[in-house]
Interface confidence: low
């Protein structure tokens, strides 16, 4: 899977959208879950509504919400009040059974309000040891990766 | 109507492989998830896996990983299944079997079949 | 894997007479979406399967309503109230709630 880039402000909310193949998806739950190292297990944030046809109520667990257009094929998690630690990598998944198919890698970056009294330039990053390799990546407000290059800069 | 023709029966040595073909009419061929299913002779249905032609996604039974690859063309509306190492008891009917979708939720249901192909295993 | 038991394994009924079947699955088959994926196929001799029952109790089109279909969580039943001779086959029951899918061991329907 590519990764895509979303970034937000601090303070502010952020959208983070996943397209899916509606027919190839339907019936299924959604969740949305934070990547913990780059070979470790998905740890779930929240999950849309256990009746799939409710899917389109949103549904919140702290300032996190997900809410799914089954018609439409498109899952939408709000971050709220962005935070310097929400900064990471997290996985929009289809749900089946015991099982989850990832729809869309994300790569949330925080960048510092630029109100704020701190450097406007500011921006926050997962932690080292969280590479992750090769992120092909869709920028979605302000930058995009290239090819190859390692989301996450090195660190001294 | 929904039609799914497979191709004709097989013989092969132990070791060979064979690709038995699903070919799909009337219906959204891209939006449906195809099944395989096999009946070894007097015995009941067992599944091999699955495949979603509009991306090529497959879930196969993890009895069969390794020596199963799912395979479709949009283009000819067609899926394969090939079987590799191929020993005495893979001789089976091999059936694909589409899956049923309904509103509201997918049923997961398979509600067309093909005929079968007759897979016979022997030296 | 989810394992699904049928019994019996064989009944011979007098036309007319009502036929029951049991399914039970070694765990629950209620999906993460809340709906249940069990399923009845029947195959007659020298056949393909053919889709009876979808999600424990919708007849598939064309099915006689002689047909039904009941359970939840990991008890099923497949009813026939009147069996009729074409009815002969072994009757399957399957799970696709999760993957990989299951069948039963089927049940030999023959006509006394």
């Known amino acids: 899977h590519n990764t895509t880039v979303f970034q937000g402000v601090a303070g502010q909310s952020l959208q983070v959208s996943c397209p899916y193949d509606s027919m190839k998806h339907w019936g299924r739950r959604k969740a949305w879950c934070r990547q913990l190292g780059e070979k470790g297990p998905c740890q779930r944030v929240v999950s849309t509504h256990n009746l799939w046809l409710l899917s389109f109520l949103r549904r919140w667990n702290g300032s996190t919400a997900i809410t799914d257009d089954t018609l439409g094929g498109t899952l939408t998690i709000t971050l709220r009040n962005l935070q310097p630690h929400d900064a990471g990598l997290y996985q929009c998944q289809s749900l089946h059974g015991s099982e989850a198919d990832t729809l869309r890698k994300v790569l949330v970056e925080v960048l510092a309000d630029p109100l704020d009294h701190r450097d406007a330039g500011d921006l926050w990053f997962p932690g080292e040891s969280e590479s992750f390799e090769d992120a092909h990546v869709e920028h979605s407000i302000s930058r995009s990766l290239l090819e190859g290059e390692i989301p996450f800069p090195p660190t001294s | 109507q929904v039609q799914l023709v497979q191709s004709g029966a097989e013989v092969k040595k132990p070791g060979a492989s064979v690709k038995v073909s699903c070919k799909a009419s009337?219906?959204?061929?891209?939006?449906?998830?195809m099944n395989w299913v096999r009946q070894a002779p007097g015995q009941g249905l067992e599944w091999i896996g699955r495949?979603?032609?509009?991306?090529?996604?497959?879930n196969y039974a993890q009895k069969f990983q390794g020596r199963v690859t799912m395979t479709a063309d949009t283009s000819t509306s067609t899926v394969y299944m090939e079987l590799s190492s191929l020993r005495s008891e893979d001789t089976a009917v091999y059936y694909c079997?589409?899956?049923?979708?309904?509103?509201?939720?997918?049923?997961?249901?398979?509600?067309?079949w093909g005929q079968g192909t007759l897979v016979t295993v022997s030296s | 894997d989810v394992v699904m038991t049928q019994t019996p394994l064989s009944l011979s009924v007098t036309p007319g007479q009502p036929a029951s079947i049991s399914c039970r699955s070694s765990q629950s088959l209620v999906h993460s979406n809340g709906y249940t994926y069990l399923h009845w196929y029947l195959q007659k001799p020298g056949q393909s399967p053919q889709l009876l029952i979808y999600?424990?109790?919708n007849r598939f089109s064309g099915v006689p309503d002689r047909f039904s279909g009941s359970g939840s969580g990991t008890d099923f039943t497949l009813k026939i109230s009147r069996v009729e001779a074409e009815d002969v086959g072994v009757y399957y029951c399957s799970q696709s709630t999760r993957v990989p899918y299951t069948f039963g061991q089927g049940t030999k329907l023959e006509i006394k």
């Open positions: 999600k424990v109790s």
């Open positions: 495949i979603y032609p509009g991306d090529g996604d497959t």
């Open positions: 009337g219906y959204a061929f891209s939006s449906s998830w």
């Open positions: 079997a589409r899956l049923l979708r309904n509103q509201p939720g997918e049923s997961y249901a398979m509600d067309y």
